[in-house]
């Protein structure tokens, strides 16, 4: 038995749950999710049982062995998979675990812009990036193109300090999971701060 | 790989026919059994894998048993309660893991009639 | 139901044609499946083992391919004594299954 094996899907996908027997008289493998038999396999009987009618299309033995491929990734096939091998030559079965994640691939990220101010000149607000249907495992970065040099910034919110007659710039937030990656659409700090050009001291959402 | 001889038998009859193995072992073989009606095709009976578990047609399930003597290199095939229908020529198999069945005997006639 | 569905029944190829069998699972079975030959009054011989590797002395005219749960065997370049019946053997929910055969005829 080795360790957990962590395997990372996309939705729609497939992912392949690698197994290396060594044993040599094989009795059955079977594969299990989150407790539920998944497929039993007796390979002298020569049976496939694939237990639930809705994974009969999903499921192969991609490499002529007993690896398990399972494919049209659903969210909820996020979980622990789990095979035993059993033989009459083994004292106890050979087992392998597995962690399954099944990633969204993203969306373009929504981008919201907090209180603005406009004092002496420089506008200053924050903006922030975020996924509409709170998709998990997000990962956030901000790019600033524009000035001398290109910046960027970790983390989902951006805060913005930019002066009036100084080159405009542009942000781009883009967000990350394990399986993708989509960027917003570019936001220009001129059109950003025209809303608080005509007062220098204004506030706004 | 050969069946022993067959022959006829006469309806509600038990059939007992043998596989004889020469130049591997029982313990790292499986043998299968297969049988073909007149005219007609191959038929899975059943088999006994390398480590003596055996597995069986849904239709043989009820009426078939296979044994093995490894001693004698033997595996046993039983089928109660013949009928016309189970007249055919049996054929016994070995079964060579992941290599598919490899090695197969001349086959034996059965004739149930009364 | 069937769940080795073998086809065609029959067909019949000229000398130096080719000929292509199929055998269609109903779920997937990996590569548990293999292809044989029969002639009159002869045993099954091996042909194709694992869906797609040639047995030990069988012609490379002989080939097995596999395409999600539907397996072919193709014979190029068909000979006079290829002419007989060939079968394919998979796994199934059941055990041991052979498809229903193929009868090959050379013109």
């Known amino acids: 038995s080795g360790p957990v094996k962590e395997l990372v899907g996309s939705v729609g996908g497939a992912v392949t749950f690698p197994l290396k027997s060594k044993v040599k008289q094989v009795d059955s493998i079977v594969w299990t999710f989150n407790t539920t038999p998944l497929v039993t396999i007796q390979p002298e009987g020569g049976t496939i049982i694939v237990t639930q009618n809705r994974n009969r299309e999903r499921v192969d033995f991609p490499d002529g062995g007993y690896s398990l491929k399972l494919s049209k990734l659903k969210k909820n096939d996020s979980g622990i998979y789990y095979v035993g091998i059993y033989s009459s030559s083994l004292q106890q079965p050979s087992t392998q675990e597995y962690v399954l994640h099944v990633y969204e691939h993203l969306s373009k990220p929504k981008v919201t812009m907090g209180l603005q101010s406009n004092k002496n000149g420089t506008c200053v607000t924050n903006l922030t990036c975020c996924m509409e249907h709170g998709e998990e495992d997000v990962i956030y970065t901000w790019k600033a193109l524009g000035q001398a040099a290109n910046e960027s910034h970790n983390g989902s919110i951006l805060p913005i300090s930019w002066r009036w007659g100084e080159s405009d710039m542009t942000f781009i937030c883009v967000a990350r999971n394990p399986v993708s990656r989509n960027f917003s659409s570019p936001i220009l700090a001129r059109k950003l701060c025209e809303g608080a050009a005509d007062d220098p001291d204004s506030s706004m959402v | 790989v050969k069946e022993s001889e067959g022959g006829l038998f006469k309806p509600t009859d038990t059939l007992t026919l043998t596989c004889t193995v020469s130049?591997?072992?029982?313990?790292?073989?499986?043998v299968i059994w297969v049988r073909q009606a007149p005219g007609n095709g191959l038929e899975y009976i059943g088999i006994i894998g390398s480590s003596g578990n055996t597995y069986y047609a849904s239709w043989a399930k009820s009426r078939s048993t296979i044994t093995r003597n490894t001693r004698l290199n033997t595996v046993t095939l039983k089928m109660t309660s013949l009928t016309a229908a189970d007249t055919a020529t049996y054929f016994c198999a070995r079964y060579y893991g992941d290599s598919g069945f490899d090695s197969w005997g001349p086959g034996t006639l059965v004739t149930v009639s009364s | 139901a069937q769940v080795l569905t073998q086809t065609p029944s029959s067909t019949s190829v000229a000398v130096g044609g080719t000929v292509t069998i199929k055998c269609q699972a109903s779920q997937s079975i990996g590569s548990w499946l293999s292809w044989y030959q029969q002639k009159p009054g002869q045993p099954p011989k091996l042909l194709i083992y694992?869906?797609?590797n040639l047995a030990s002395g069988v012609p490379s005219r002989f080939k097995g391919g596999r395409s999600g749960t539907e397996y072919s065997l193709t014979i190029s370049g068909v000979q006079r004594e290829d002419a007989a019946t060939y079968y394919c053997?998979?796994?199934?929910?059941?055990?041991?299954?052979f498809g229903a055969g193929t009868n090959v005829e050379i013109k």
């Open positions: 053997l998979g796994a199934s929910p059941n055990g041991w299954a």
């Open positions: 694992g869906a797609s």
């Open positions: 130049g591997f072992s029982l313990n790292s073989y499986g």
